[in-house]
């Protein structure tokens, strides 16, 4: 008798109502491998989830996140709000990065500025709440005179002659 | 068969009231947090509120000290009081089970409402 149910193929279960007779998966449900006893009952994408595959006989419906969530967990398991650039999702909805800290991604947490200095670098050009800091040469590095937010001359590649 | 319905939508004035109430069956109610999202003509979701099984209450900073949730577990019916409303308020608000827990976060099985309009106008 296991025999008969290793030969009903996927989108099909083993009917033991009906002397184990390969019969069609019912409406909104699938099985994704041959020899089933039941078909699983399909994912429905409802509330901020939206379609991006429909079920078939043979495999689950997937979904996505409408706009303004994104994707969290495996098989996109959970929506999240999105935040824009330069603000975090807090207990009281989106927020501004504090200061000394940024977020250049609409999702994520804001993360403290690059420290140029434990690098022995200086601060090339300030941070921003949606953007770290860039850092530059170390101080010693500069010329005497030259200021700290001067950037260096590029480098030259080789075979092109300075302009 | 889980079911959410809301209810208590409505025209009102700026400064006005609603009180909005999601009678739920088919579920654990009594064991669920619950949540409230809207939806405004031409922009996207937004979590609203949300209520922790034990209680326990979260509001976005749009609404925070105008909206109230709450619940009644003998009911089966989770409730949005709606206070000193504004025009941006006019949106259609849906009931939802919160199973993440996560502000502005639903889980693939948390259950929905049909959403009932509020709009507010004078």
């Known amino acids: 008798l296991q025999d008969l149910c290793s030969n009903c193929p996927a989108g099909t279960f083993c009917d033991n109502n009906r002397s184990q007779i390969c019969s069609p998966c019912p409406p909104n449900s699938f099985s994704s491998a041959g020899g089933q006893r039941t078909c699983d009952i399909c994912r429905q994408c409802k509330g901020v989830f939206k379609t991006r595959k429909e079920c078939s006989s043979t495999s689950n419906a997937e979904c996505d996140c409408i706009s303004g969530y994104h994707c969290l967990g495996a098989e996109c398991s959970m929506c999240e709000q999105d935040c824009k650039q330069g603000q975090e999702l807090t207990k009281k909805g989106c927020k501004d990065c504090c200061f000394g800290t940024f977020n250049d991604q609409k999702r994520g947490i804001c993360r403290p500025w690059t420290n140029c200095s434990l690098d022995g670098k200086s601060v090339l050009v300030n941070g921003t709440k949606e953007r770290d800091v860039v850092c530059g040469p170390s101080p010693a590095d500069l010329s005497p005179g030259a200021s700290s937010a001067t950037p260096p001359a590029p480098a030259r590649e080789p075979g092109h002659s300075p302009q | 068969e889980v079911d959410l319905v809301e209810s208590g939508g409505g025209l009102v004035q700026p400064g006005g009231s609603l009180r909005l109430s999601c009678a739920a069956s088919?579920?654990?109610?009594?064991?669920?947090?619950m949540s409230w999202a809207r939806q405004a003509p031409g922009k996207g979701f937004e979590w609203v509120s949300g209520?922790?099984?034990?209680?326990?209450?979260y509001y976005v900073d749009s609404v925070e000290g105008r909206f109230t949730i709450s619940r009644d577990n003998a009911k089966n019916t989770v409730y949005l009081q709606m206070n000193s409303l504004k025009p941006e308020d006019t949106a259609v608000y849906y009931c939802?089970?919160?199973?993440?827990?996560?502000?502005?976060?639903?889980?693939?099985?948390?259950?929905w409402g049909q959403g009932t309009q509020v709009t507010v106008s004078s």
């Open positions: 939802a089970t919160w199973g993440s827990q996560q502000i502005g976060v639903w889980h693939e099985d948390d259950y």
């Open positions: 088919g579920f654990t109610f009594s064991r669920s947090a």
């Open positions: 209520i922790y099984s034990g209680g326990s209450t």
